[in-house]
């Protein structure tokens, strides 16, 4: 589910194994499958589960990626 063409999935067990613009998660719908890969970070106003999912300069607040200099997503 990367936006970059010909992206080679990199297997991972935790976010620290991925690049600064990536996080570690299952690419399958519902996230039920066991295999995890490095996925492109989530931009502002996207759903998130944890800070590492959000792109640099953003963090996960109440399930939404928000800018680090903002208090809310709206």
């Amino acid at each position: 589910y990367q936006t970059i063409d010909n992206y080679q999935p990199y297997p991972c067990a935790e976010d620290e194994e991925c690049g600064t613009d990536e996080y570690c998660a299952s690419p399958t719908r519902g996230g039920d499958a066991g295999v995890q890969i490095c996925l492109a970070c989530r931009k502002r106003r996207k759903r998130c589960m944890r800070h590492a999912m959000c792109c640099p300069g953003n963090y996960c607040k109440n399930g939404i990626c928000v800018s680090s200099d903002q208090n809310h997503f709206r």
Epitope: Y1, T3, G31, K46, M49, G63
Partner: antibody, heavy 119, light 107 residues
Framework: QVQLVQSGAEVKKPGASVKVSCKAS????????INWVRQATGQGLEWMGW????????GYAQKFQGRVTMTRNTSISTAFMELSSLRSEDTAVYYC????????????WGQGTTVTVSS | DIQMTQSPSSLSASVGDRVTITCQAS??????LNWYQQKPGKAPRLLIY???NLETGVPSRFSGSGSGTDFTFTISSLQPEDIATFYC?????????FGQGTRLEIK
């Protein structure tokens, strides 16, 4: 099988509140978001907001801020949507729908609950 | 917020025809677009996700394409059971937005 079953039709007076339930079965309730979408007769689909049943986090469309509350009871795998200060324009069919947190799509929908607001 | 504009708002076609519906986003949404079918009195049904991926169990005559701001939904050969209203929906970011719908009728 995977399904969402909603509560029955409601008739309410203007100014009242309505609480619609959505019971999930056939999958792990806390693994998917629940979204609420409404549709007035002959009109299009209108997104109201989302709820993460795992954390209880919610996000509401600006139009409904302050009037809508989305909650859940994980022990009975049920999501709830309460809309207050009802007016005639809130007369619609209200749907719950499942998505994962990537918003790949609302792949499972409830059957809909008709809410009629009339004096 | 992102606005989604669908066209046409309604169309009439014959069985076997190729039918095309377009959806335009007010800003770039990459491929974060879904298509739904809704038959009268029923809940919507997800047909296409991520702009071009066919949902499980959906007939292959349905397809989607596009990215950025312009998207297309196609029925390669219209069947009588396809009569419904079709909606696009963006999920690039919150708030979620649906197109106004395209009502499809049989000629």
């Amino acid at each position: 099988q995977v399904q969402l079953v909603q509560s029955g039709a409601e008739v309410k007076k203007p100014g009242a509140s309505v609480k619609v339930s959505c019971k999930a079965s056939g999958y792990t309730f806390t693994s998917y978001d629940i979204n609420w979408v409404r549709q007035a007769t002959g009109q299009g689909l209108e997104w109201m907001g989302w709820m993460d049943p795992n954390s209880g986090n919610t996000g509401y469309a600006q139009k409904f801020q302050g009037r809508v509350t989305m909650t859940r009871n994980t022990s009975i795998s049920t999501a709830f949507m309460e809309l207050s200060s009802l007016r005639s324009e809130d007369t619609a069919v209200y749907y719950c729908a499942r998505t994962d947190y990537f918003y790949f799509g609302m792949d499972v929908w409830g059957q809909g609950t008709t809410v009629t607001v009339s004096s | 917020d992102i606005q989604m504009t669908q066209s046409p708002s309604s169309l009439s076609a014959s069985v076997g025809d190729r039918v095309t519906i377009t959806c335009q986003a007010s800003q770039d949404i990459s491929k974060d677009l879904n298509w739904y079918q809704q038959k009268p009195g029923k809940a919507p049904r997800l047909l296409i996700y991520d702009a071009s991926n066919l949902e499980t169990g959906v007939p292959s005559r349905f397809s989607g394409s596009g990215s950025g701001t312009d998207f297309t939904f196609t029925i390669s050969s219209l069947q009588p059971e396809d009569i419904a209203t079709f909606y696009c929906q963006q999920y690039d970011h919150l708030p979620i937005a649906f197109g106004q719908g395209t009502r499809l009728e049989i000629k």
